[in-house]
């Protein structure tokens, strides 16, 4: 706190507010009889800049020229020092350093809409740190002038509140902005423009779309614009896309036909307007119109596959599977699939519409030649049917692909490789790689996956519906005309040791040997493809190492004989399972004593 200047005065020249880089004169003078007692020569006046001494003088006054002050405020304090006493504050001064306004740059004016008002913006340049008054002046024909002021440190926008009209669209107007503060002034370069230069139309409104005869090929976009609009640009895109299609149109009068829209697609449409071919600016984009185009009949054909299962001597089960058409092929909401089953020699046909599924199972006689046709239908029609002759896909042994392997390829991918069949490899028309989760019961409800591969390919990466720690039964089919050959393998994308061993459910004696039966490990505990089972046994109460028998894993197998047990000796038996990653923990332990006679 600096006391009011009772003992002396501080005067400042030229002002308390100065230009950056200029000099200020500070004079400190004592009032009469306010110096040290006895001798005025002993008056020592000291000038402080903040807390640092910058000058001193013996006598009644001190004069100091100060330069190099930074932007903002600097505090100076004048003090009196007498012998044998503390320094006494005389008076203080704050000097504020600012800058004169720079020339305002990039002055530009705009009138939003034909009924809007003229508003201008500019770049202020360097911050002056001072109250700066901006005056915007607009002069027009017939010596008309308008003026608007804003008194704000950060002023870079002013609205004249006047409306330019199109009566004389080529008349020139000139705008200029002047910035003034206590340290100086500066004016922008003048900006000259016409009505057409500065009127920015309002964005179009009331946008609608019409499809004549509910057809995507007869589509018209309608909108409303201000009266003087000459040009429009349209942009549109599918709602799920980031890229716009752009169209420029002249004298559209609020309508334009669009010819390249895709069926059954939600589009976003926006329109912008301009008054003149090369003058003025485009309006903002209109609000978006979102609309779905009508359906068209599906294109493309379904990818169909099938599976045959023997039921008895006279019947077989056929399971048909197909993949959904892509959105661009479906061209609408698929209402149903039409499946036609026909016996080729007798001509008897059966047609069924399937909704909500992409599979169909039926039972047919084992005799006769059967064919199926599957098509997809939306509200506008059906796709071309995919026709398949039902054959024994694995009948031709010479067409079976050779050396099939399945290897993990990163997360949730399996790379399947094979060699062409021995029979003339050029006869192969295509390969089909099929995979499904391995279920010990051979459950036909397990979803089937497949992909088609060109005849020159000898590998395929399967990734659809592949889960970690699940074993898949993979088949590679080579198809040639009405013949097929196949090979199969088990594979997984990721594996670890099974979480449990098989559960022994029975041990029976048969002619001096035993038959061990077990329950399969639950699928979720197998942790990949099982390679082997191990049966361990040792004499009860013995500390010796157990003996073991390793059995290659086969899906359907759940029993195995052992004939190396001694009669009338009690054994403890248990089982484990192995994947490529390691061995499971023990399953349950069972005791058994063979009753038969010793050899």
């Amino acid at each position: 706190k600096i006391d009011a200047c009772k003992r002396g005065d501080v005067t400042v020249k030229p002002s308390h507010v100065i230009l950056l880089g200029s000099t200020v004169n500070i004079t400190c003078s004592l009032k009469p009889r306010q110096g040290c007692f006895h001798y005025s020569r002993r008056n020592k006046l000291i000038l402080y800049k903040f807390d640092r001494r910058i000058n001193f003088h013996h006598g009644h006054s001190l004069n100091s020229q100060v330069t190099g002050l930074p932007l903002g405020t600097t505090l100076f304090v004048c003090k009196l020092a007498c012998i044998n006493s503390d320094e006494i504050q005389i008076c203080g001064a704050e000097i504020f350093v600012g800058v004169a306004p720079e020339q305002p740059q990039n002055l530009s004016c705009i009138q939003k809409g034909e009924q809007g008002t003229v508003a201008c913006t500019w770049e202020r340049g360097r911050d002056t740190h001072l109250y700066t008054e901006y005056t915007l002046q607009l002069s027009g024909p017939k010596n008309l002038t308008w003026q608007k002021q804003c008194k704000d440190i950060y002023c870079d926008y002013l609205d004249f509140g006047i409306n330019l009209t199109p009566e004389s669209p080529e008349s020139n107007f000139t705008a200029k902005v002047t910035a003034v503060n206590s340290l100086g002034s500066s004016s922008s370069l003048p900006s000259t423009f016409t009505f057409l230069d500065i009127v920015r139309p309002l964005p179009p409104w009331d946008i609608r779309i019409k499809f004549q005869k509910a057809s995507v090929s007869r589509c018209t976009l309608y909108w409303r614009d201000e009266g003087l609009v000459l040009l429009n640009r349209l942009r549109y895109r599918p709602s799920n896309s980031r890229l716009w299609n752009m169209v420029n149109v002249t004298k559209a009068k609020g309508r334009h036909d669009l010819l390249d829209l895709k069926p059954f697609t939600e589009y976003e449409f926006q329109i912008s307007s301009k008054l003149h071919l090369y003058k003025g600016s485009w309006s903002d984009w209109s609000e978006s119109l979102r609309a779905q185009t009508p359906e068209e009949e599906p294109t493309g054909m379904l990818d169909v596959w099938y599976m045959k299962r023997h039921i008895d001597y006279s019947r077989q089960q056929i399971s048909l599977f197909w993949k959904n058409l892509s959105v661009s092929e479906a061209r609408g909401k698929i209402l149903h699939y039409q499946v036609t089953l026909q016996e080729l020699t007798g001509g008897k046909a059966m047609t069924q519409n399937i909704t909500g599924h992409t599979s169909w199972t039926t039972v047919i006689p084992r005799t006769g030649n059967w064919a199926v046709a599957v098509s997809a239908a939306n509200s506008k029609g059906s796709s071309l049917p995919t026709r398949i002759n039902i054959m024994n896909l694995c009948e031709a042994g010479l067409l079976a692909p050779r050396q099939v392997s399945a290897n993990s390829e990163g997360m949730d991918n399996i790379l399947v490789t094979w060699q062409p069949p021995r029979k003339d490899p050029s006869a192969v028309q295509e390969y089909v790689v099929e995979w499904r989760e391995l279920h010990p019961g051979g459950d036909t409800q397990v979803p089937l996956n497949w992909l088609r591969s060109r005849p020159y390919n000898v590998s395929a990466l399967i990734s659809e519906n592949i889960k970690s720690y699940i074993c898949y039964e993979i088949r590679v089919y080579a198809l040639s005309g009405d013949q097929g050959g196949c090979s199969s393998i088990l594979g997984n994308s990721k594996h670890k040791a099974p979480l449990s061993g098989p559960h022994i459910n029975a041990i029976t004696e048969e002619k001096g040997s035993i038959l061990i039966s077990w329950n399969s490990i639950p699928v979720q505990e197998q942790m990949g493809c099982l390679l082997h089972y191990r049966i361990y046994w040792k004499e009860r109460d013995s500390n010796s190492q157990p003996q073991l028998c390793e059995i290659p894993y086969r899906v359907s197998q759940n029993s195995h004989p052992i004939n190396s047990l001694q009669p009338r000796v009690t054994y403890v038996l248990w089982m484990t399972a192995l994947t490529a990653a390691g061995e499971s923990s023990h399953g349950n332990e069972r005791e058994f004593c063979l009753q038969g006679k010793a050899n």
Partner: nanobody, 119 residues
Framework: QVQLQESGGGLVQLGGSLTLSCAAS????????MSWYRQAPGKQRELVAE???????TYADSVEGRFTISRDNAKNIVDLQMNSLKPEDTAVYYC?????????????WGRGTQVTVSS
Amino acid sequence: QVQLQESGGGLVQLGGSLTLSCAASGSAALIFLMSWYRQAPGKQRELVAEVSRYGSTTYADSVEGRFTISRDNAKNIVDLQMNSLKPEDTAVYYCKADQYYGDSLRSSWGRGTQVTVSS
């Protein structure tokens, strides 16, 4: 922003005295500088005198020794004691207050009071 009200103007004889007063109201905190400016017909507005919140002063060369500026920080009042008035002192006198606004100064002006010196 601060509002400023000037008073004390009027007609005065050559060589006479007059005291102008300016009262600040509203958000009058942190007024850095209070000043008197004047504008004679057809001329630019010019600084007459200013006083900082610490009591330091500045005078235009043309009024030094004749005019005294003083300030009451508690009441936010600034007075301009004008002695030995001359015809060239005839002008509209404006009060101005500069306030801190962040790291900048924001100025407020009064509406002015007329001083006429007759010979």
